[in-house]
């Protein structure tokens, strides 16, 4: 019999040599070992060269082996999981050449004082990195640049005083970040970028609350639902968020998220966010676009936060408590009327696919009741918006286009947001935000608005199409009018042209955030409901075949909004794919939306 016990797990031969008082690798290890447990032995040093002939080796456990040095002088081409935890390693050699397939690396509970800049070079498959409970005082810039697939990063229980500002750059898959129990005083501006991190642990640090903490404070406010207090032996999914666990060491342990920041400058340069301090407690809208195709999944969200100028944003942030568990893979951008320039990231693979588009617009009304009506009301100053709804269903074999326009008119001085899926005309001063299904562009400060273009190309053998409506509202005091173009191209052999409507209105001075709404749909259903005591809800479902071409990502000051904030869970557009062999028109998403 072997010194070590042998079994098999998921087709891998598992050899367990734990706690056998070994000082070296056993001589009788099976050549086809796939999982090797060498933990709790007295190996002292270990060389990967000793395992190069084990060509099936996928998991290697070297925990609690009293290791003081590791040599990566032999290539283990299949090794995916390496456990070096609970040893005495003071440094790590470069691992990429020897372990190119590594997905999980655990070097926790060692004596690492620092890491060399290229220690992770070549670890392109790494998904989990555990460095907790070491003596790390700093991290080299670019440490994680090679590990673009990283999902879990644990840096807890170290002596980190600061973090490199670009540490998380490019880590789009990161979902869990442990930074608790370090000596951190602040978080660099822009540190989290546009990442949505469902699980973050930040407690037990030396957070110093002064004006430098404002970026971090705002991030905590926006991600309150994703900040947790770590408890030993408790799965994070079984705990509740605890943003208050992040406390100011210099202010009687007051929560960082509620730090008032009195006297601090409020320009976006100071916070790496748009200026939130001048936005009142008013209803907010949020539009999200989620793309997922039958190829590699990518998800992109936009958000709009629109409000009239007022005093402070702090109270609003606190008044929007998160309620749900986080959802992964959702990058969400918030924009206000402050400058910034954002387009959809150029991350989606362009692939002709069948999509289902669902637009869900929910606007939170002021404390008033809304009654739908189909009659035109006199535009007197009142607080009841008049809602006119229309429902269109195009039968399968119809060969005649059915033009439809849903027009919602809000009376003067209304402060109630009204959802729309077609044309929205806002007379006189108003604070009505409008969702968009196209690409969102926020301009730098300029007196010249940007033109808006919507282009739709329909497939060749098309028999029925529904009109495309593009609406743009420009504030009166724009010094240059904004040309709006809605261009529809119907290729040869299409039996029916598609009517296109482009409406341009220029109301009185307004702080309304208004965006192009473009609908492209052979089958269009618009439903407007106003149940008692619930937000107005508009649902638009579209099915179309398309190839998506996205604008390049431009430099942007953006921030993340927690996906799960129930008060901000507003318009949502979901593009969900399914396989199809139908012909595919091309939807060019180079629409842009003017933000006054």
């Amino acid at each position: 019999q072997h010194t070590c016990s042998i079994s098999k797990v998921t087709s891998l031969l598992e050899v367990n040599c734990e706690n056998k008082k070994l000082t070296a690798l056993p001589a009788d290890l099976p050549a086809d070992t796939g999982i090797l447990h060498l933990g709790e032995n007295q190996l002292g040093t270990f060389s990967t060269a000793s395992l190069v002939h084990f060509t099936h080796l996928t998991y290697l456990y070297l925990d609690r082996c009293e290791l003081t040095s590791l040599q990566t002088n032999g290539k283990l081409i299949k090794l995916e999981n390496l456990d070096l935890s609970h040893n005495n390693l003071k440094s790590l050699p470069s691992l990429g050449w020897a372990l190119p397939a590594l997905t999980t690396l655990d070097v926790s509970f060692n004596k690492l004082g620092s890491l060399s800049p290229g220690v992770l070079d070549g670890l392109s498959q790494l998904q989990e990195l555990y460095l907790q409970n070491n003596d790390l005082k700093s991290l080299p810039p670019g440490l994680l640049l090679p590990t673009t697939k990283l999902k879990k990063l644990n840096l807890a229980n170290n002596k980190l005083r600061e973090l490199p500002s670009g540490l998380l750059d490019g880590l789009e898959d990161l979902d869990t970040l442990y930074l608790q129990r370090n000596w951190l005083r602040t978080i660099p501006k822009g540190f989290f970028g546009t990442l949505l991190l469902p699980f973050v642990f930040l407690h037990a640090n030396s957070w110093y609350c002064d004006c430098e903490i404002l970026y971090f404070r705002h991030w905590l406010q926006e991600n309150a639902n994703n900040v947790y207090l770590w408890k030993q032996g408790v799965d994070v999914k079984d705990t509740t968020p605890n943003v208050a666990s992040v406390r100011c060491a210099n202010l009687d342990n007051a929560p960082v998220y509620s730090y008032p920041g009195k006297g601090c400058p409020t320009s976006s340069g100071d916070t790496d966010y748009d200026d939130y301090d001048d936005i009142p407690d008013v209803p907010a809208t949020r539009t999200e676009v989620k793309f997922s195709t039958n190829t590699k999944v990518h998800t992109t969200h936009w958000s709009l936060l629109a409000a009239a100028p007022s005093t402070s944003q702090d109270s609003q942030m606190i008044s929007l408590p998160p309620t749900h568990k986080p959802t992964k893979k959702q990058s969400t951008f918030i924009h206000t009327q402050s400058p910034g320039f954002t387009t959809l990231p150029e991350t989606m693979e362009s692939n002709p696919t069948f999509y289902s588009l669902k637009l869900n617009t929910v606007l939170i009304p002021s404390p008033t009741t809304l009654e739908p009506t189909s009659t035109q009301a006199t535009p007197e100053p009142n607080i009841q918006p008049m809602l006119t709804t229309s429902t269109l269903t195009t039968p399968e074999h119809s060969t005649t286009p059915v033009p439809t326009t849903t027009i919602l008119t809000t009376p003067e001085h209304s402060t109630i947001p009204v959802p729309t899926t077609a044309i929205l005309t806002t007379p006189k001063p108003s604070t009505i935000p409008v969702p968009t299904t196209a690409t969102l562009t926020t301009l730098e400060p300029s007196t010249t608005p940007v033109p808006t273009t919507a282009t739709l190309t329909t497939p060749e053998p098309s028999t029925t199409l529904v009109p495309t409506t593009a609406t743009l509202t420009t504030p009166e005091h724009s010094t240059t009018p904004v040309p709006t173009t809605a261009t529809l191209t119907t290729p040869e052999h299409s039996t029916t042209p598609v009517p296109t409507t482009a409406t341009l209105t220029t109301p009185e001075p307004s702080t309304t955030l208004t965006n192009l709404v473009s609908t492209i749909s052979p089958v269009l259903t618009t439903t407007l409901t106003t149940p008692e005591s619930t937000p107005i809800e508009t649902i638009l479902e579209q099915f179309f075949t398309t190839e998506l071409t996205l604008l390049p990502t431009l430099e942007s000051t953006t921030t993340i909004i927690p996906e799960q904030n129930s008060f901000l869970n507003l318009p949502e557009v979901a593009l969900v794919s399914s396989d199809t062999s139908e012909s595919s028109p091309f939807l060019n998403s180079d629409f842009c939306c003017f933000l006054p």
Epitope: I6, S7, V9, T10, L12, L13, P30, A31, D32, E80
Partner: antibody, heavy 118, light 113 residues
Framework: QVQLVESGGGVVQPGRSLRLSCAAS????????MSWVRQAPGKGLEWVAS???????YYPDSVLGRFTISRDNSKNTLYLQMNSLRAEDTAVYYC????????????WGQGTLVTVSS | DIVMTQSPLSLPVTPGEPASISCKSS????????????LAWYLQKPGQSPQLLIY???TRESGVPDRFSGSGSGTDFTLKISRVEAEDVGVYYC?????????FGQGTKVEIK
């Protein structure tokens, strides 16, 4: 076609030994993991031992230390050496082939009966 | 060890009618690395050795009629026979091939009514 033929079964007293053989044909024997599975009279199936194509054996606790699986690739033969036999080892012993590195059994022999009785 | 529990233990069937056998494991048989469930089904006809029907939960062995199908994930699995034929009688076993020791269910005896 794949064929597995077991032999060596019989009646044996408790505490004694027996060696089963399985002659394989119709496939490249050395490339496949092989196993022994038994079935007590009127009962279900129970895995007894396996050996990888590289010759690594592994067992359930019930036979560990008593049974030894081995193979002779030059003879295309699988063996099961059974020592310290007990009454509860009475069963039909099947030789079975595993699919590649996986551990389901795609071909079975007709079985050989081992009876442990005093 | 992973315990496999089958039900029912006896299943009287009518030819041409569908039949279904359940198999539950005491722990998940899903391998997160490849998203495969490591479960196989065998039929042992009277007086014969077992024959492989299905592996990895739903992959039919070559030569097995398409009236046999497997489904399930994690700990709950099902073998379905869409239209039972007389030759389908025997004892059906599920087996987990997730981790050794490989274990079988106690068997379900399918017989014609």
């Amino acid at each position: 076609q794949v064929q597995l033929v077991e032999s060596g079964g019989g009646v044996v007293q408790p505490g004694r030994s027996l060696r089963l053989s399985c002659a394989a044909s119709g496939f490249t024997f050395s490339s496949f993991a092989m196993s022994w599975v038994r079935q007590a009279p009127g009962k279900g199936l129970e895995w007894v031992a396996s050996i990888t194509s590289a010759g690594t054996p592994y067992y359930p606790d019930s036979v560990l230390g008593r049974f030894t699986i081995s193979r002779d690739n030059s003879k295309n033969t699988l063996y099961l050496q059974m020592n310290s036999l007990r009454a509860e080892d009475t069963a039909v012993y099947y030789c079975a082939r595993s699919r590649g590195y996986e551990d389901y059994f795609d071909y079975w022999g007709q079985g050989t009966l081992v009876t442990v009785s005093s | 060890d992973i315990v496999m529990t089958q039900s029912p233990l006896s299943l009287p069937v009518t030819p041409g009618e569908p039949a279904s056998i359940s198999c539950k494991s005491s722990q998940s048989l899903l391998n997160s690395r490849n998203q495969k469930n490591y479960l196989a089904w065998y039929l042992q006809k009277p007086g014969q050795s077992p024959q492989l029907l299905i592996y990895f939960t739903s992959t039919r062995e070559s030569g097995v009629p398409d009236r046999f199908s497997g489904s399930g994930s994690g700990t709950d699995f099902t073998l379905k026979i869409s239209r039972v034929e007389a030759e389908d009688v025997g004892v059906y076993y599920c087996q987990q091939h997730y981790s050794s020791p490989w274990t079988f269910g106690q068997g379900t005896k399918v017989e014609i009514k």
